[in-house]
C-alpha cells in the first residue's frame, strides 16, 4: 500500500495550523488544527498532548481525559461543564484546554 | 515501571474470583489498562480494557463473564461465574495506542471441584 | 471480527540462520500490528509495535514489515536466547486481537 503526495496513512495525524497569542501576561493562548486520517470508530483528537486519532464514543460522551490528552506524569481532570480539561503538572502548573 | 497481579488462587466453580492489578511507577490514569488470560499451552486471549472514566470494552466471549473495575490505585478483574474453562494465568497490560508495553508477572487462577 | 492467522505453528532454526514468521489479518488492519516474544513462565515482551517499530533495548536482527493484511516478523542471525513463543497481535480495533502463536526452537 504506496500512499500518494498529501496522503496520511491510517490513524495518524498531522499539525495544519499553530497559532499563539502570548499577549495577556502570564498567559499564551494556542489554536491548533490538525488533519487526521482516523480509521472507522475513530475521531480527531488529542493525545499526549499531539493529535492523534481516538475512540470516537470519547468525544460524543465528552470524556476527554479517556483520550490521555496530558503527558505521562500530569494529572488529566474535566473542565466543570465539559468544554474541554485541564493537564496539571507536577510541579502544580496547570493548562487548560477547550474544545470548539 | 512495573505492574503486579495478585488473588490468583485455586476456586471451585461457580465461586466468584477477584484478581487486582496494582502499578508501580506510573498512574493508571495515564494509561488504558487490560486484562489478558492464557490457558496453560495455549496462547494469548484478551479479556478487555478500562479507560480513565471507567468506561470498559470487552471480547464479545467475555461480556458477562468477567467485570473489569479499577480504583485510583488498582485495577481488578472479577470473574463472575468461574468454570474449568477459565483455568489460567491472568496477565494485566497496559496501553496508549494499542498495543501492550508493559505486563504484569501474571497470577495463577485454577477452577476445580 | 478480526481474526490473525500466525504461520508456521512452529519452526526448528539453526544459530546465526534466518527465521521468518507470518501472520495474516482477515481484514486491512492498516499496520496496526505488534510482535511479542514469550519465555516459559513468563509474561510477554513487547518487540515490535506499528508493524516496524522496534522497541528501546530489543535486538535489532528483530525487525518487522507488511501492510494491509499480511505481516512478517523476521529475526535475522538467530541467537540461542531467541528460542521462544512469538505472537503477533492487531489492534486496529476491538476487540483486540492475537495471533495463536509460534513456538521458535533453536538447534
Known amino acids: 500500500q504506496f500512499l500518494k503526495e498529501g496522503q496520511l496513512a491510517a490513524g495518524t495525524c498531522e499539525i495544519v495550523t499553530l497559532d499563539r497569542d502570548s499577549s495577556q501576561p502570564r498567559r499564551t493562548i494556542a489554536r491548533q488544527t490538525a488533519r487526521c486520517a482516523c480509521r472507522k470508530g475513530q475521531i480527531a483528537g488529542t493525545t499526549r498532548n499531539k493529535p492523534s486519532c481516538v475512540d470516537a464514543r470519547i468525544i460524543k460522551t465528552k470524556q476527554w481525559c479517556d483520550m490521555l490528552p496530558c503527558l505521562e506524569g500530569e494529572g488529566c481532570d474535566l473542565l466543570i461543564n465539559r468544554s474541554g480539561w485541564t493537564c496539571t503538572q507536577p510541579g502544580g502548573r496547570i493548562k487548560t484546554t477547550t474544545v470548539s | 515501571q512495573s505492574l503486579e497481579e495478585s488473588g490468583g488462587r485455586l476456586v471451585t466453580p461457580g465461586t466468584p474470583l477477584t484478581l487486582t492489578c496494582t502499578a508501580s511507577?506510573?498512574?493508571?490514569?495515564?494509561?488504558?489498562m487490560n486484562w489478558v488470560r492464557q490457558a496453560p499451552g495455549k496462547g494469548l486471549e484478551w479479556i478487555g480494557i478500562?479507560?480513565?472514566?471507567?468506561t470498559t470494552y470487552y471480547a464479545g466471549w467475555a461480556k458477562g463473564r468477567f467485570t473489569i473495575s479499577k480504583t485510583s490505585t488498582t485495577v481488578d478483574l472479577k470473574i463472575t461465574s468461574p468454570t474449568s474453562e477459565d483455568t489460567a494465568t491472568y496477565f494485566c497490560?497496559?496501553?496508549?495506542?494499542?498495543?501492550?508495553?508493559?505486563w504484569g508477572p501474571g497470577t495463577l487462577v485454577t477452577v476445580s471441584l | 471480527e478480526l481474526d490473525l492467522t500466525q504461520t508456521p505453528p512452529s519452526l526448528s532454526a539453526s544459530v546465526g540462520g534466518t527465521v521468518t514468521i507470518n501472520c495474516l489479518a482477515s481484514?486491512?488492519?492498516?499496520?496496526?500490528l505488534a510482535w511479542y516474544q514469550q519465555k516459559p513462565g513468563k509474561p510477554p515482551t513487547l518487540l515490535i509495535s506499528?508493524?516496524?517499530n522496534l522497541e528501546s533495548g530489543v535486538p535489532p536482527r528483530f525487525s518487522g514489515s507488511g501492510s494491509g493484511t499480511d505481516y512478517t516478523l523476521t529475526i535475522g542471525g538467530v541467537q540461542a536466547e531467541d528460542a521462544a513463543t512469538y505472537f503477533c497481535?492487531?489492534?486496529?480495533?476491538?476487540?483486540?486481537?492475537f495471533g495463536a502463536g509460534t513456538n521458535v526452537e533453536i538447534k
Open positions: 478500562i479507560y480513565p472514566s471507567g
Open positions: 481484514e486491512d488492519i492498516y499496520s496496526a
Open positions: 511507577g506510573f498512574s493508571l490514569s495515564s494509561y488504558y
Open positions: 497490560a497496559r496501553t496508549v495506542s494499542g498495543y501492550f508495553d508493559i
Open positions: 506499528g508493524t516496524s
Open positions: 497481535q492487531g489492534y486496529s480495533s476491538y476487540p483486540l486481537t
